[in-house]
Interface confidence: medium
């Protein structure tokens, strides 16, 4: 070897200086007696190496970097040789950061492989080898006193967890832990944790089921669930509570909480859910009441609240067929009793003949709000009921009676808008306990069938807006029928349009006869139509040849008009405005010529 | 020096309730696992129950899971065991227990005899 | 859970022998198996912790070994007091189930 590097330290602080010496041999005799030494970093030429010789004949450089601002590199002690450079020696040099101390550690106790787990964040990069130790010691108390050391945990390289195994941990008293980090420049030791393992138990949550339904438990009631959960077992001994999540699957409901609740429950109900809806449920468990970590949610387990019977009132009303009185068709309305009345999947209509203990006859079961039967002669109440899975509601009882009560008077409607009709009345005496109102489209287009109804349960109302299928330029009758406890009074009517239509054409003006200062006209009125409201007067208008204008107002009951004091030998232009309370519509015009003075008249 | 005292047995029938308490002195009793052991007659011991030092890992063999409770006071050095639905099954001679470190039981009391029977 | 094996269930033996008692575990348990001794009586005192430890106060004739799930108690020169009932027991878990106990009787 003709060349030695030594340096200050092979290893630095980053950005650190650092000092290094050659020495070449003397007896390296095919050099020059006075070779130049030259000092390469990596790749570079670095200047500044101060050469000098030494007593025994030996030549050295000494060179010092000021800032070693690489995290590894070479540095070479050269000789120029013919016209390439010699590396002489070489050396690595390795510059980095001591170890940060490091943080956020934290373990967790593994009880399906009884081992403690210790995380943690090991700090920025040093750029040098750095290992990680998890050192522990035994410990009664709170870890002031420190007992015997249990065997060192070091991770593999490049992670920073490391497992102590059931063997090195103790279940009965509390542990020290803490993180060593060491590399070249120096070591460094994280905060110290002081814990039975037991305290950071890692849960796994229990397993949702499902009741099996016994045949002699109770069903589950409406909006309620029955469930049970199977403790995980390598837990069972640790005290710990649980909560469980639902929510509806469908909708963006969210989750709702319930808890806290056993470790272990043989069955347990669940109830305030939505009748028939389906539910997801998740259950979680954590040491209680000391401290611990949850457990993640378990798998999710789906179910289906039972429904509830209709909660529903059943207004109703019927009415007999005129060629056929037993023929009865009977209306009826669901008015929910509770913000969920529960689904409504069909209506049965039954009767139940006297002297037949428990035989009860149905006389029809639909999905439709109505449905006509024929009345047993005996008959003179059926009941009414809304059923689903869960039954039925309460039975409405309809009694078919003769209308024996008062009737109500002075029966009115009026327009509210072009979608709603005020009907009014003065009531009778007694008071009803309620009313029926019906409408549906008046003449021609009058149908029992498709008549809409509402009941008004307080008797002492004097009106009822009427807002459902109400459409403007229609002609609307309107039925009110007052109910007593027993009976009924007669039924009123009154025709109403919610708006009406202007006339969509006046009629044709005519000429009967014509004089020198008269002319007679006449027209056929329009014929009534659908919709439009009934004329209230005519007017009509006539304009001579001075566009001087002239008009007169007749009842619409007019079918003629004679005008008087006209000019003779003129010119003419006449019309007819039809007006009801809707608007008015003009006739064509009709031009005539009075006669010259000296023409005869014209009849 | 190390003392455990047993009291609360006697005689009570099948389906009854019985609660023993164990008072300890002479050590950190917060510091340290108890637990239960009995000794029906004649029979070999029988682990009961043990209870960590501050009462939140609650261990039971199957034989009484679900009937026994152990619990324990810290500020009065007291272990406690309370047994529901008593079996014939359940007469035995109770043991408190101070567990050491390695889950060895270090100390036990004199014992306090349970009968049930009708 | 673990369930403890003892054997023999006794043995009949005279002063000055070597006794020889064995525990099986039904799964491994390390060295967490301790052994107790029990005179009619009186309540059992501990005899051998974590295998081999021999608790203070315990004759050295008394020595423990095993590892796993096979473990022995040994009493090198059986004396007069050492009659008794001894039990093994596994602190591995936090079920801490004895053996079925081995009486010792004078032959």
């Known amino acids: 070897e003709c060349g030695h590097i030594s340096v200050s330290a092979p290893i630095v602080h980053l950005g650190d200086p650092i000092t290094a010496s050659c020495i070449i041999k003397q007896n390296c005799s095919h050099l020059d007696p006075e070779p130049q030494i030259l000092w390469r970093l990596g790749a570079e030429l670095q200047p500044g190496g101060r050469q000098q010789r030494l007593s025994d004949g030996t030549q050295e450089s000494i060179i010092t970097l000021p800032h070693l601002n690489h995290t590894q590199a070479f540095l070479s002690c050269c000789l120029n040789w013919g016209n390439s450079l010699q590396i002489l020696d070489q050396v690595e040099l390795r510059a980095g950061y001591p170890p940060a101390i490091p943080h956020n550690l934290s373990c967790l106790m593994n009880l399906t492989t009884s081992s403690l787990i210790c995380q943690w964040e090991p700090g920025p990069e040093t750029h040098l080898p750095t290992s990680f130790t998890l050192k522990s010691f035994k410990s009664r108390g709170n870890c002031q006193t420190q007992g015997d050391s249990i065997l060192d945990c070091v991770p593999k390289d490049g992670q920073s967890h490391c497992c102590i195994p059931r063997k090195h941990l103790l279940l009965y008293q509390n542990m020290g832990i803490w993180v060593q980090a060491e590399n070249a420049l120096g070591t460094s030791m994280s905060p110290q944790l002081c814990l039975d393992p037991m305290d950071v138990v890692k849960l796994e949550p229990p397993m949702l089921r499902t009741m099996d339904p016994s045949p002699e438990a109770a069903p589950p009631q409406a909006g309620c669930l029955q469930l049970c959960w199977e403790p995980w077992q390598p837990g069972l001994h640790i005290n710990q509570k649980c909560e469980l999540r639902h929510k509806p699957q469908r909708g963006e409901a969210s989750w709702a909480l319930v808890g806290p609740l056993p470790l272990e429950a043989l069955q347990y109900e669940l109830c305030g859910l939505l009748p028939a809806t389906a539910y997801t449920l998740q259950i979680r468990c954590i040491r209680w009441p000391l401290p611990g970590h949850w457990s993640d949610w378990s798998p999710s387990l789906e179910l289906r609240t039972t429904e509830r019977a209709p909660t529903v009132r059943l207004d109703t009303w019927w009415r007999q067929r005129q060629l056929d009185p037993r023929t009865v068709q009977l209306f009826w309305k669901p008015v929910p009793l509770e913000e969920d009345s529960g689904r409504i999947q069909g209506y049965v209509v039954s009767w139940r003949p006297s002297g037949q203990a428990g035989a009860i006859l149905p006389l029809c079961n639909t999905t439709e709000l109505s449905c006509t039967f024929h009345l047993p002669s005996e008959a003179q109440e059926v009941a009414l009921v809304a059923y689903n899975s869960a039954g039925t509601s309460r039975p409405t009882p309809v009694v078919f009676s003769e209308s024996r009560g008062p009737a109500l008077t002075r029966l009115h409607a009026m327009a509210r808008d072009p979608h709603s009709l005020w009907v009014g009345w003065e009531p009778p005496n007694p008071w009803p306990q309620g009313y029926v109102i019906e409408w549906g489209l008046g003449p021609p287009s009058a149908s029992n069938s498709n008549k809409t109804w509402r009941m008004e349960q307080n008797g002492r109302a004097t009106g009822f807006l009427l807002k459902e299928n109400i459409r403007p330029f229609q002609l609307y009758e309107i039925i009110v029928t007052p109910l007593y406890q027993d009976t009924m009074g007669p039924s009123q009517h009154v025709y109403a349009y919610s708006q009406e239509m202007a006339p969509s054409h006046a009629p044709e003006l005519h000429l009967k006869h014509i004089g020198k200062t008269w002319a007679q006209l006449e027209w056929v009125p329009e014929p009534p139509e659908l919709g439009k409201s009934p004329l209230t007067h005519y007017t009509i208008f006539w304009t001579n040849a001075q566009n001087q204008s002239f008009s007169a107002i007749l009842n619409a009951s007019s079918r003629g008009f004679v005008l008087h004091g006209l000019e003779p030998a003129s010119l003419y232009h006449i019309h007819l405005m039809a007006a009801s309370q809707a608007g008015a519509t003009n006739s064509t015009v009709l031009t005539l010529m009075t006669l010259t003075p000296e023409g005869s008249e014209l009849h | 020096e190390v003392q455990l005292l047993e009291s609360g047995g006697g005689l009570v029938q099948p389906g009854g309730s019985l609660r023993l308490s164990c008072a300890a002195s002479?050590?950190?009793?917060?510091?340290?696992?108890m637990g239960w052991v009995r000794q029906a007659p004649g029979k070999g011991l029988e682990w009961v129950s043990s209870?960590?030092?501050?009462?939140?890992?609650?261990p039971y063999a199957d034989s009484v899971k679900g009937r026994f409770t152990i619990s324990r006071d810290n500020s009065k050095n007291t272990l406690y065991l309370q047994m529901n639905s008593l079996r014939a099954e359940d007469t035995a001679v109770y043991y408190c227990?101070?567990?050491?470190?390695?889950?060895?039981?270090?100390?036990w009391g004199q014992g306090t005899l349970v009968t049930v029977s009708s | 859970d673990i369930q403890m094996t003892q054997s023999p269930s006794s043995l009949s033996a005279s002063v000055g022998d070597r006794v020889t008692i064995t525990c099986r575990a039904s799964?491994?348990?390390?060295?967490?198996l301790n052994w107790y001794q029990q005179k009619p009586g009186k309540a059992p005192k501990l005899l051998i912790y974590?295998?081999?430890n021999l608790q203070n106060g315990v004759p050295s004739r008394f020595s423990g070994s095993g590892s796993g799930t096979d473990f022995t108690l040994t009493i090198s020169s059986l004396q007069p007091e050492d009659f008794a009932t001894y039990y093994c027991q596994q602190s591995w878990v936090y079920h801490l189930p004895f053996g079925g106990g081995t009486k010792v009787e004078i032959k």
């Open positions: 002479g050590f950190t009793f917060s510091l340290y696992w």
């Open positions: 227990a101070k567990l050491g470190e390695l889950g060895e039981i270090r100390e």
């Open positions: 974590y295998a081999s």
């Open positions: 799964q491994g348990i390390s060295s967490y």
């Open positions: 209870i960590s030092s501050s009462g939140g890992v609650t």
